[in-house]
Interface confidence: low
């Protein structure tokens, strides 16, 4: 069990999404509509995991990690590639260890095999990511 | 109830290719993935590859790659793998499971993958001259 | 061989409790979680415990699993002779990008 003073997360999970992150934690009730908070029963460290695909970056998951582990030392959500579900789109992830830090993200690095989207750094959207 | 229901014992020669199919009954099969596993006799699990039947993305292991190829049907809720170029070291069960990662093709859970929960009943495959 | 590390053995008598252990690397168990299953021997796998330490519907809450860093454990207590199988752990591994099994721990109920 975490510490009492819990780490709170932003959670969400796209439609379609199996298998649920939410036992990771305890809902916190933000008003309607997302985003929603998750305080996190078993680490310090949120995640947040997002699609990005032909330019645009679409959040997939939000939430709590189960256990402390590398990465969530970072005040941030820097994501990284890690895998790639098609040859036109790559999922990016972060972890970061403060409240609400994975929200969003300042800036997707190159994605590898990505094809190339155009001539800027790809970005959610002005304000952040597209939620579904 | 949820089932998977594998296609049946197969001998084959060294070089020849081998196709199983694996149907699914009791769920809408577009909502998940299916993986395919073998074991070789009296060893361990091996994971061969997965398909999202949703949208036909695959992921295969990297020793079978070029060698192996998933597909899906989803007229007839039925999954297949063949595998080319058979060796004598192929002989195994070849197993089919649902898979708990998403059928939507969002990918991998991740940090958060549920495994696998519905398994066939396997189909031997012997390759022998 | 396995990536993943398991004892190929492990014996108790019924009522007992037994741990099984996996042992991985910082590409898999310590950055994914992990799954274990259960074979019976002529038998396709079950599985037993998803995300570390969850139970499907229909396991006995006497099989429970953990997680710490980049090794995992599977607890069986009070065993009974039907758990007499083969026991598998699993992860994601992100260097492979695919998914690994441990080679399996035959677990033997005496008496």
């Known amino acids: 069990q975490v510490s009492p003073n819990r780490r709170t997360c932003v959670f969400f999970e796209a439609p379609g999404v199996r298998g649920s992150t939410k036992t990771l934690g305890e809902m916190v009730d933000a008003g309607p509509g997302p985003p929603k908070g998750i305080r996190c029963l078993y680490s310090h460290c949120c995640f947040g995991i997002w699609n990005l695909t032909h330019g645009r970056a679409q959040v997939e998951m939000q939430g709590c990690r189960d256990s402390d582990e590398p990465g969530c030392e970072s005040l941030h959500c820097d994501p990284v590639p890690r895998a790639h579900p098609n040859p036109s789109s790559t999922l990016f992830t972060c972890s970061c260890g403060t409240d609400f830090c994975n929200a969003n993200y300042s800036h997707l690095p190159p994605s590898g095999n990505q094809g190339a989207p155009g001539p800027q750094e790809p970005q959610a959207t002005p304000g952040g990511p597209v939620w579904m | 109830q949820v089932q998977l229901v594998q296609s049946g014992t197969e001998v084959k020669r060294p070089g020849a290719s081998v196709k199983i199919s694996c149907r699914a009954t009791?769920?809408?099969?577009?909502?998940?993935?299916i993986s395919w596993m073998r074991q070789a006799p009296g060893q361990g699990l091996e994971w061969m590859g997965w398909?999202?039947?949703?949208?036909?993305?695959?992921n295969y292991a990297q020793k079978l790659q070029g060698r192996v190829t998933m597909t899906t049907d989803t007229s007839t809720s039925t999954a297949y793998m063949e595998l080319r170029s058979l060796r004598y070291d192929d002989t195994a069960v070849y197993y089919c499971?649902?898979?708990?990662?998403?059928?939507?093709?969002?990918?991998?859970?991740?940090?958060?993958?549920?495994?696998?929960?519905?398994w066939g009943q396997g189909t031997t495959v012997t390759v022998s001259s | 061989q396995p990536v993943l590390t398991q004892p190929p053995s492990a014996s108790g008598t019924p009522g007992q409790r037994v741990t099984i252990s996996c042992s991985g690397s910082?590409?898999?168990?310590?950055?994914?979680?992990v799954n274990w299953y259960q074979q019976v021997p002529g038998m396709a796998p079950k599985l037993l415990i998803y995300?570390?330490?969850q139970r499907p519907s229909g396991v006995p809450d006497r099989f429970s699993g953990s997680k710490s860093g980049t090794s995992a454990s599977l607890a069986i207590s009070g065993l009974q002779s039907e758990d007499e199988a083969d026991y598998y752990c699993a992860a994601w591994d992100d260097s492979l990008n695919g998914v690994v099994f441990g080679g399996g721990t035959k677990l033997t109920v005496l008496g």
């Open positions: 995300s570390n330490n």
């Open positions: 910082r590409s898999n168990i310590g950055r994914n979680t």
């Open positions: 009791g769920y809408t099969f577009s909502d998940y993935g």
């Open positions: 398909i999202s039947a949703y949208n036909g993305n695959t």
């Open positions: 499971a649902r898979d708990g990662r998403r059928g939507s093709g969002i990918y991998w859970g991740v940090y958060y993958y549920n495994g696998m929960d519905v």
